[in-house]
Interface confidence: low
């Protein structure tokens, strides 16, 4: 008879990514005996919480907790029962809650309290619900991408750990309410708030990161809508033939639209607004989101924010991926260069509502907003972050790596569960030749 080797025991971790527009649950797993290996933690399963983000429950905090129940019940099924008590559970809220925390700290505390109450009812090892800073969101996204792509260390055939020669990958995240850019740099930080020093597997990394609040896709669309209401009787980024009634209260309730908010307005008034398919006016409207007038440092991205020159290759995920994927797949447009990306944005902005619907059947929900989204992505990358054609050639638009969603959630869990050691593992690892 032959001994059957049992598969290694698995460990699990759960992160709830409470974004501005919705919450996603990610369950990660890894072999218990290989905790310090790189790239060993992967996504086991995921679940999208129905409804809006937890920040949308400001007036009904208990509803925020209740909204998570369906996914938590799935977690009970997805994680083996005997592993429940040892499975860490985290909730991290991002820019939607950062905005709520700015405008209504009490409501933000109530929402987090309600969510905590729900999460503590489950048999997992709940380790807290909190609002991530913009820096955390950026850095943990960068950690996730480079961990999954095994850029930190490699395990050589002789059983030695070594750092691969390929550098790290920069990370660009476009969420609903904020956008983050993070990359390794050799330039000294002129603004200490934008520099993060990391020690991972015995290697030192100097990372530049910045999060732009109000520059997430949903908030950008709200700001463009507010600008269109302010300066035009139409929306140049919406397709001709598309019209809708806009509730002024919805447009102006966000702190991101405060600059365009009229002194007095009727929050319950509805204004009819139509699209005009005007790529040039749309570009002007999007340009208004970026200010290049003052820079207190030797160089800036926009709005007076310090940024060293972009360096190395980048992975652009979340709404960067969805926007570019729409242009590439749904519209069949090439986007390999900045020039092509701009041409693709102009192409979409030229389409009438009828043409768009014919081109992309069954995708009504955000169809009218892809012109603005594409124009914003193109301007953010080229004018905002300063990518030229050469640098843009090193950007990949991808939402997953190693079958795991790229975002801050995995990096956050890796950090809080100490799955990335600061120092390298022992010089040699036992090599199994069986």
């Amino acid at each position: 008879t032959r001994d059957i080797r049992e598969p290694p025991a698995l460990k699990y971790g759960i992160v709830l990514d409470a974004g501005s527009s919705h919450t996603s649950m990610f369950i990660y797993k890894w072999p218990a005996d290989k905790e310090n290996d790189t790239g060993i933690v992967g996504q086991h399963s995921s679940c999208d919480v129905p409804g809006g983000g937890i920040s949308s429950y400001a007036d009904n905090p208990s509803g925020a907790g209740q909204s998570l129940v369906g996914c938590l019940e799935q977690a009970l099924r997805d994680v083996p029962k005997e592993r429940h008590a040892g499975t860490p559970l985290y909730l991290g809220a991002t820019a939607g809650m950062r905005l709520l925390n700015l405008t209504n700290p009490e409501a933000s505390t109530s929402v987090l309290t309600a969510v905590t109450h729900t999460l503590t009812q489950y048999p997992f090892d709940f380790r807290g619900a909190r609002i991530l800073s913009g820096q955390e969101e950026g850095v943990f996204g960068w950690v996730t991408a480079n961990y999954l792509l095994e850029n930190f260390i490699k395990y050589g055939w002789v059983g030695r750990w070594f750092r691969p020669r390929k550098g790290t990958l920069g990370a660009m995240d476009l969420g609903g309410a904020s956008t983050q850019i993070t990359f390794e740099t050799t330039s000294p930080a002129e603004d200490r708030a934008s520099e993060v020093q990391l020690r991972l597997y015995g290697q030192h990394y100097r990372v530049y990161t910045h999060s732009f609040l109000c520059y997430g896709r949903d908030q950008v669309l709200q700001r463009l809508l507010a600008s269109a209401l302010q300066t035009h009787s139409f929306h140049p980024c919406w397709p001709r033939g598309f019209s809708t009634h806009v509730l002024l209260g919805d447009v102006y309730q966000s702190p991101c639209t405060v600059a365009q908010r009229p002194q007095t307005f009727n929050s319950s008034a509805r204004v009819s607004l139509s699209g005009s398919s005007d790529p040039h006016l749309c570009r002007d409207l999007v340009s208004g989101l970026f200010s290049f007038s003052s820079c207190p440092f030797s160089r800036c991205s926009f709005n007076g924010v310090f940024q060293p020159p972009v360096a190395g290759n980048f992975i652009a995920f979340s709404a960067f991926f969805y926007t570019v994927n729409f242009l590439r797949t749904s519209m069949g447009l090439p986007v390999a260069t900045l020039q092509q990306l701009e041409a693709a944005a102009v192409n979409v902005c030229n389409q009438t509502w009828a043409q768009l619907q014919a081109r992309v059947p069954g995708q009504q929900a955000h169809l009218a907003d892809y012109c603005a989204g594409a124009m914003f992505v193109q301007q953010l990358l080229s004018r905002g972050y300063g990518f030229d054609e050469r640098a843009f050639g090193g950007v990949i638009f991808q939402k997953k790596a190693a079958d795991t969603a790229v975002g801050w959630a995995l990096g956050y869990m890796l950090n809080l569960t100490n799955l990335i050691p600061a120092d390298p593992p022992g010089l040699r690892k036992g090599t199994d030749f069986s």
Epitope: T103, T109, Q135, E136, V196, L198
Partner: antibody, heavy 125, light 106 residues
Framework: QVQLVQSGAEVVKPGASVKISCKAS????????MDWVKQAPGQRLEWIGD????????TYNQQFKGKATITVDTSASTAYMELSSLRSEDTAVYYC??????????????????WGQGTLVTVSS | EIVLTQSPATLSASPGERITLSCSAS?????IHWYQQKPGQAPRLLIY???NLASGIPARFSGSGSGTFYTLTISSVEPEDAAVYYC?????????FGGGTKLEIK
């Protein structure tokens, strides 16, 4: 260098109000939150609340809600704290403190890196 | 709120002596800071984030700990170290301070 200079000592009657100031210099005022801390005789330090000068948003320790009101004048790089309905137990030294931060793994770890010299408020009839 | 209990309340030490001050939290905190306050002065940041020495603080000061128990160690006490030492948590709202440990030099 970074400095916080507070207004002078105050003697006030019970039931009255007092407004103390904290003038910042040596750094960009809107880049850091300003916090206020109470030190009553023989008591531990107590955090009162803070203000984010960039967004003019203040947060308070529940125990000081209704007692303290924190404001800023960004053009003068000055933070203020008004204490109302004063009683003898409000007698204390009040400090303003700049909220510094330390970034590690992208996490902001906050602490009070620069303090004002303190303002003694004595409530006495 | 999280209550921080410092011990001992008062400590008397001779120059050159190694001493340890402790800070115990009523529930787990991620990190704590230590401040030094000399008579008639404002508190001064000594150690931030459990173990990081603040700018201008001599290397004889060190901090450690995790969870609910943290310590501040002075490896070789100097006369100018006479002060009250406070621990402070910023993990859970509202931010709280310990009651302080008064260090007297013999």
């Amino acid at each position: 260098q970074v400095q916080l200079v507070q207004s002078g000592a105050e003697v006030v009657k019970p039931g009255a109000s007092v407004k103390i100031s904290c003038k910042a210099s040596g750094y960009t005022f809107t880049d850091y939150n300003m916090d206020w801390v109470k030190q009553a005789p023989g008591q531990r330090l107590e955090w009162i609340g803070d203000i984010n000068p960039k967004y003019d948003i203040s947060t308070y320790n529940q125990q000081f809600k209704g007692k303290a009101t924190i404001t800023v004048d960004t053009s003068a790089s000055t933070a203020y704290m008004e204490l109302s309905s004063l009683r003898s137990e409000d007698t204390a030294v009040y400090y303003c403190a700049r909220r510094g931060f330390f970034l590690y793994y992208g996490i902001n770890y906050y602490y009070f890196d620069v303090w004002g010299q303190g303002t003694l408020v004595t409530v006495s009839s | 709120e999280i209550v921080l209990t410092q011990s001992p309340a008062t400590l008397s030490a001779s120059p050159g002596e190694r001493i340890t001050l402790s800070c115990s939290a009523s529930s787990s905190v991620s990190y704590i800071h230590w401040y030094q306050q000399k008579p008639g002065q404002a508190p001064r940041l000594l150690i931030y984030s459990t173990s990081n020495l603040a700018s201008g603080i001599p290397a004889r000061f060190s901090g450690s700990g995790s969870g609910t128990f943290y310590t501040l160690t002075i490896s070789s006490v100097e006369p100018e170290d006479a002060a009250v030492y406070y621990c402070h948590q910023w993990s859970s709202y509202p931010w709280t301070f310990g009651g302080g440990t008064k260090l007297e030099i013999k």
